[in-house]
């Protein structure tokens, strides 16, 4: 003998977050008379999704006109799907009863899986800057994706990195997942312009992976090299001494001239020149009045770079010899814009 069956033809339905899910249900008979209800989950804790008879279900619409007595199609649409909507949905036929309707037959269930895109990967580097030859760690995080399968790659200037560790959480079943990866990068002096890229590939992205980037300019500190040279005499009894500060990054730099250990002048690097690799050069001049000194003068160029302990370079200026014959004839790297440094 024929008896009403509730057919849910789709064992599973996969929907992208934000889209509408159609859950199909057909009753194979118009009798017994009674409403259909949709539930998520089974058992006592099941959640009512739609009740044909009563209630307000703003996100749910019926595919067919359920007011027609000859309707057999009890499919529903759920709008604006989120990962939280994932689960197994059951179409349940009730038989009209008094005082309450009685559950008569349930469909086999349709598992709704939600495809959710991962959030844009956020790459963060170390809190403090590090110098070349040091290894630094970068982290990459992306959240809210489903299903769990995901691929993460690290690149430095287009070259794939291999030294990284990745975790996808949680380990068990969940409505959505997060990925966390830590990569180790060895810094070089040429890394001011370098970029570290975290690339995330997921089924929802249709082959167009998401990328998060970190500029190594935020991470690296390239300490300067100093060179102090004595220039030809500019005027009688005056010697021009230059301190060339080369290949430093970032720009934050303070230079102090000391004459025999006493502070002569302090200045902050302003008009710098940039090298192709992104590091900076700067030059400071000190005009020393030789006639003011009876003894030899020890000139020190002391540089404090990016809050680090000062480094210095000294030059001994002999006052006994004739100024015109003194020192080296090394040409200064004079850009013209540094004239204000000449005292």
């Amino acid at each position: 003998e024929e008896e009403l069956q509730v057919i849910q033809p789709d064992k599973s339905v996969l929907v992208a977050a934000g889209e509408t899910a159609t859950l199909r249900c057909t009753a194979t008979s118009l009798i017994p008379v009674g409403p259909i209800q949709w539930f998520r989950g089974a058992g006592p804790g099941r959640e009512l999704i739609y009740n044909q008879k009563e209630g307000h279900f703003p996100r749910v619409t019926t595919v067919s006109d359920l007011t027609k007595r000859n309707n057999m199609d009890f499919s529903i649409r759920i709008g604006n799907i989120t990962p939280a909507d994932a689960g197994t949905y059951y179409c349940v036929k009730f038989r009209k009863g008094s005082p309450d309707d009685v559950e008569f037959k349930s469909g086999a269930g349709t598992e709704l899986s939600v495809r959710a895109k991962p959030s844009a990967p956020v790459v963060s580097g170390p809190a403090a800057r590090a110098t070349p030859q040091h290894t630094v760690s970068f982290t990459c995080e992306s959240h809210g994706f489903s299903p769990r399968d995901i691929t993460l790659k690290w690149f430095k200037n287009g070259n794939e990195l291999s030294d990284f560790q990745t975790n996808v959480d949680p380990v068990g079943e969940s409505v959505s997942y997060s990925i966390h990866s830590t990569a180790k990068v060895v810094l070089t002096r040429e890394d001011v312009h370098s970029q570290v890229i975290c690339e995330v590939a997921h089924v929802t992205l249709q082959g167009d992976p998401l990328r998060g980037t970190a500029n190594l300019s935020e991470t690296i500190r390239v300490p300067p090299t100093l060179e102090v040279t004595q220039q030809p005499v500019r005027a009688e009894n005056q010697v021009n001494v230059t301190c060339q500060v080369r290949k430093f990054y970032p720009q934050r730099l303070q230079l102090t001239w000391l004459e025999n250990g006493n502070v002569s002048r302090t200045e902050t690097a302003s008009t710098v020149t940039e090298n192709k690799d992104g590091t900076y050069n700067w030059m400071s001049w000190l005009l020393v009045n030789v006639s003011a000194h009876r003894d030899d003068v020890k000139l020190t160029c002391q540089v404090e770079h990016d809050g680090q302990p000062a480094v210095s370079k000294s030059h001994d200026l002999k006052v006994s010899a004739h100024p015109k014959e003194q020192g080296s004839n090394t040409a200064a790297e004079n850009t013209g814009s540094n004239e204000r440094n000449i005292y």
């Epitope: 199909r24 067919s64 000859n70 199609d73």
Partner: antibody
């Protein structure tokens, strides 16, 4: 006026395929469930398949399940029946039909086409 | 599937006669039953829906009754244009099924 016109019938060898079309006019095609019903020569009527007004639900008779596919193009007001792996017993006049009940599958067929003959023979 | 047994399979009656056709369902189908008329070489035409409701435009000499398993279709006064085969169809259960048909002829 309301009209359904079938086409695509013909003689075909067993195991081959055929695609029937049903052009609808005179009513809001996209609001109604649509059916295919067939009638073997000198025999009675047999329901074949139904498709919901929006294509979301499709049901088939056991005799054609897995071989026939019902579909529709609401932008063209056209119903289709793709018939694969045809057998001699599929020889029949194929009618498309609909009911006057909007937004349901509707099984009281008040509008019928004139039918198209499909002959499956080697 | 629900079996629909129609009887007689054919009948011959005179113009003006009352003609009765019966349709029996293999189990209770409530009143979800339709009656169709099919003239030779033509598509079927819906006459009665939900066992007893006359389709718009159908002459009142056609009527239907019954519920559960037993249904009756009646032509109160047979007319020459009524020569056709008549089918019952249930749609309580899927798939919808038709009776074998009753061929009505004029004596």
């Amino acid at each position: 006026q309301v009209q359904l016109v079938e086409s695509g019938g013909g003689v075909v060898q067993p195991g081959r395929s055929l695609r029937l079309s049903c052009a609808a006019s005179g009513f809001t095609f996209s609001s109604y469930g649509m059916h295919w019903v067939r009638q073997a020569p000198g025999k009675g009527l047999e329901w074949v398949a139904v498709i919901a007004y929006d294509g979301s639900n499709k049901l088939y008779a056991d005799s054609v399940k897995g071989r026939f596919t019902i579909s529709r193009d609401n932008s063209k007001n056209t119903l289709y029946l793709q018939m694969d792996s045809l057998r001699a017993e599929d020889t029949a006049v194929y009618y498309c039909a609909t009911s006057d009940t909007k937004y349901t599958l509707g099984f009281a067929f008040d509008i019928w086409g004139q039918g198209t003959m499909v002959t499956v023979s080697s | 599937d629900i079996q629909m047994t129609q009887s007689p399979s054919s009948l011959s009656a005179s113009v003006g006669d009352r003609v009765t056709i019966t349709c029996q369902a293999s189990q209770d189908i409530s009143n979800y039953l339709n009656w169709y008329q099919q003239k030779p070489g033509k598509a079927p035409k819906l006459l009665i829906y939900d066992a007893s409701n006359l389709e718009t435009g159908v002459p009142s000499r056609f009527s239907g009754s019954g519920s559960g398993t037993d249904f009756t279709f009646t032509i109160s006064s047979l007319q020459p244009e009524d020569i056709a085969t008549y089918y019952c169809q249930q749609f309580t259960y899927l798939p919808p099924t038709f009776g074998g048909g009753t061929k009505v002829e004029i004596k």
